[in-house]
Interface confidence: low
């Protein structure tokens, strides 16, 4: 390729636009992946309980795909820059194993939504919210993990349960064989509280006095955060893939044309 | 049973930082309902609340001596501390932890036995 | 803040005689829930304070039931049935309505 042709220079200025784009989005997709893993709404016990934190796993990859990418992005510009056939056969092989894991992070992210389902939560929450006799230390942990985080999100969100109080009357729980069902028919963090963290009128929480307990179910408090990050690591990361697709086939065409 | 047993430095000099550890027993922290308050006492006079940390980690600090205290607690440890910054001879007093439960209303239903604490230059 | 305002002494009792002991507030103590948020606490000599009165009129465990309270929105009133001798301290009246929370100056029952 001759490379005082203007076309050259001007295809050339093309692959460095798209690769600092890619590198720009390298680094939006690591931040929004450590937003993600470092768990700021404290929701990572309940996924952890339930034996399945792939989204997890997918936003970890991310976190790596997009320090790659910006990585990348740096060898693909210097590659073009200088025309070197090495440098660019480099970056392809590399960008090529990053893809695979990208693709890999989207579709984990993506398939994820279907497993966020309000019987996922309750299920575990029955089984495991305030279970004092668990098999092992594992479960131990993870039922005080669980525990812990109901009990913050029943307070903190003024929700009770995940579809509402009638989960803890309706199903078998560990939470009703620790406790009596007629001084605890839901638990405490159920009631209206005071500034004392008391409850309000315990009596008329108890009985179930509309004002005096938390009517309506944490579900959407749990499963929005979820999906909104899977949407994001999965959607994001689609787009990267999109635009690297092109990036990375005009560089190939590129190389192909460069001189020995 | 439960038991509550406060420590701290004994003597220390004005300006400097009152740290006092409640350890506990017989209770949990990390059960819904569940505080700790600090209470202190100057020889022969009356009691006066400091600060309160509960089971989900609100802190509940008396206005005036806010800016001073800072109120913790170690749940793995049934451990609870409070920190003075700046102190100076008035706060020479007797330092109570207690529990405070909501299914008494708040009250503190159970008292260590006090630790005395002297500030003087 | 709510002030908590008590007698420094009470009228000197005979033993297994009655004694009573009074606690003003500067505001009601009643919430609208319907719970009074009163305390009464027994500081014997040389000991820490000791629960024996929740919610105005509820006996904490372990207290005998010779002590007993009563009271509207702002005037409380402790009663000791058959004063013992174990009973000498200082009666402190408390409340936890409004942060921050507020004691008395304390009651020294007297024995004559």
């Known amino acids: 390729m001759a490379k005082d042709n203007s076309t050259v220079r001007c295809f050339q200025g093309l692959l460095i636009f798209g690769n600092v784009i890619i590198g720009c989005c390298g680094i939006a997709l690591t931040a929004e992946c450590i937003f993600f893993v470092s768990d700021q709404h404290s929701l990572y016990p309940l996924l952890e309980a339930t034996d399945n934190d792939d989204i997890y796993g997918a936003a970890w990859i991310g976190i790596f795909v997009g320090i790659c990418l910006f990585c990348l992005s740096v060898l693909g510009i210097v590659g073009i820059m200088k025309s070197s056939r090495k440098i660019l056969l480099a970056y392809f092989i590399l960008m090529f194993i990053v893809y695979a894991f990208e693709v890999a992070s989207c579709i984990t992210a993506a398939t994820q939504q279907d497993f966020f389902t309000p019987n996922l939560f309750l299920k575990q929450m029955l089984e495991r919210y305030q279970n004092n006799s668990p098999p092992n230390n594992d479960d131990q942990w993870k039922n005080n993990g669980v525990t812990k985080t109901w009990d913050r999100l029943m307070l903190q969100d003024n929700c009770c349960g995940v579809n509402g109080p009638s989960d803890w009357q309706k199903y078998t729980s560990a939470f009703r064989t620790e406790n009596n069902d007629a001084d605890y028919p839901w638990p405490r963090q159920c009631c209206v509280m005071n500034n004392l963290k008391e409850p309000l009128n315990l009596e008329a929480c108890k009985l179930g006095v509309p004002g005096f307990y938390h009517n309506q179910g944490c579900y959407e408090l749990i499963s929005g955060p979820m999906n909104r990050h899977a949407w994001g690591v999965a959607w994001f990361g689609f787009a990267i893939l999109c635009w690297t697709f092109w990036v990375l086939l005009g560089t190939m065409f590129y190389w192909s044309r460069i001189e020995y | 049973q439960i038991t509550l047993k406060e420590s701290g430095p004994g003597i220390l000099q004005p300006s400097q930082t009152l740290s006092l550890t409640c350890s506990f027993s017989?209770?949990?922290?990390?059960?819904?309902?569940?505080?700790v308050g600090w209470i202190r006492q100057p020889s022969g006079k009356g009691l006066e609340w400091l600060a309160n940390i509960w089971w989900n980690d609100d802190q509940y600090y008396n206005p005036p001596l806010k800016s001073r205290l800072t109120v913790s607690k170690d749940t793995s440890k049934t451990q609870v501390f409070l920190k003075i910054a700046h102190v100076d001879t008035a706060d020479t007093a007797t330092y109570y932890c207690?529990?405070?439960?909501?299914?008494?209303?708040?009250?503190?239903?159970?008292w260590g036995q006090g630790t005395s604490v002297t500030v003087s230059s | 803040d709510i002030v908590m305002t008590q007698a420094a002494f009470s009228n000197p009792v005979t033993l297994g005689t009655s004694a009573s002991i009074s606690c003003r507030s500067s505001?009601?103590?009643?919430?609208?829930?319907?719970?009074?948020?009163l305390y009464w606490y027994l500081q014997k000599p040389g000991q820490s304070p000791q629960l024996l009165i929740y919610q105005m009129s509820s006996l904490a465990s372990g207290v005998p039931d010779r002590f007993s309270s009563s009271g509207s929105g702002t005037d409380f009133t402790l009663r000791i049935s058959r004063v013992e001798a174990e009973d000498v301290g200082v009666y402190y009246c408390?409340?936890?309505?409004?942060?921050?929370?507020?004691f008395g100056g304390g009651t020294k029952l007297e024995i004559k």
């Open positions: 207690a529990r405070i439960y909501s299914g008494n209303y708040g009250a503190m239903d159970y």
């Open positions: 505001k009601s103590l009643l919430h609208s829930n319907g719970i009074t948020y």
């Open positions: 017989g209770f949990s922290l990390s059960t819904s309902g569940m505080g």
């Open positions: 408390a409340q936890s309505l409004e942060l921050p929370y507020t």
